[in-house]
């Protein structure tokens, strides 16, 4: 199955790569812009120069293209924790990221919240916090495990999930997320 | 057995407001972040909001910033969604939900759905 391709790629598909074709004509092929600039002016004929004009701050192209504007920078969300891991220059978006210690939580494909790394008090450090997960704690005897924390089990109370973990027979509990809940 | 019960759907015109509650039983709301979830008609499950286990900290998606607000009362085990002036997009069935931090966009533990239908 051939799939389905929109106007413009099929526009490209029929230069060689790296050329689009001219949108008023399509018997012409004209150069791609390079990254980190956008297309001004459709080259006039084969073999002749399109006009491709760098981005202005604030904006970036990051691949070959034939944009007739540059994108424009993304901004870190600082009220999401996010910091500048590296400045947008023409040719690169701006590069988010999160502290030393923390990693991130994905609220939407493109939107992500930093938290701080569990230190596994009361208990150890079974998996180290990674980019997108945070630490792993396996608690000592006498404590479990909530919301990543261990916490002594004088705070469970009855009938709650935490009584499976803290029954006084287990010597040693490794905190477990509540059963069905994940 | 962890469940959770969502309340408050139903019909409103454009402009108009709803409430939805969220009853859980068989674990403690103030121990995690909990959130609402929706999923619009031939759509994909989305963030609405979400809210820390305290309350001092919350999540808005940006579509429902400064029209919808989210609350606990840990001591009902209870969570809620204020919706104002509600939009004809807004329309879909929300989810109460755990949230499970890390990584993403994950939708944990949810309930059945409450149904929100903005027409006039």
């Known amino acids: 199955l051939v799939p389905h391709l929109g106007d413009r790629e099929k526009r490209d598909s029929v230069c060689p790569q790296g050329k689009y074709i001219h949108p008023q004509n399509n018997s012409i092929c004209c150069t791609k812009c390079h990254k980190g600039t956008y297309l001004y002016n459709d080259c006039p004929g084969p073999g002749q120069d399109t006009d491709c004009r760098e981005c202005e701050s604030g904006s970036f192209t990051a691949s070959e293209n034939h944009l007739r504007h540059c994108l424009s920078c993304s901004k870190c969300r600082k009220e999401m924790g996010q910091v500048e891991i590296s400045s947008c220059t023409v040719d690169r978006d701006t590069v988010c990221g999160c502290r030393k210690n923390q990693y991130r939580h994905y609220w939407s494909e493109n939107l992500f919240q930093c938290f701080n790394c569990s230190l596994c008090l009361n208990g150890t450090v079974h998996l180290s916090c990674q980019e997108k997960q945070n630490t792993v704690c396996t608690c000592h005897a006498g404590f479990f495990l909530r919301e990543n924390e261990c916490v002594s089990c004088s705070n469970c109370k009855k009938s709650l999930e935490c009584t499976k973990l803290c029954l006084p027979q287990i010597e040693n509990v490794k905190g477990t997320e509540d059963s069905g809940t994940t | 057995e962890v469940q959770l019960l969502e309340s408050g759907g139903g019909l409103v015109q454009p402009g108009g407001s709803l409430r939805l509650s969220c009853a859980a039983s068989?674990?403690?709301?103030?121990?995690?972040?909990m959130g609402w979830v929706r999923q619009a008609p031939g759509k994909g499950l989305e963030w609405v909001s979400a809210?820390?286990?305290?309350?001092?900290?919350?999540y808005y998606a940006d579509s429902v910033k400064g029209r919808f607000t989210i609350s606990r009362d840990n001591s009902k085990n209870t969570l809620y969604l204020q919706m104002n002036s509600l939009r004809a997009e807004d329309a879909a069935v929300y989810y109460c939900?755990?949230?499970?931090?890390?990584?993403?966009?994950?939708?944990?533990?949810r309930g059945q759905g409450t149904l929100v239908t903005v027409s006039s």
């Open positions: 939900a755990k949230v499970k931090l890390g990584g993403g966009p994950n939708f944990g533990y």
């Open positions: 068989g674990f403690t709301i103030e121990w995690y972040w």
């Open positions: 809210i820390s286990g305290s309350g001092g900290s919350t």
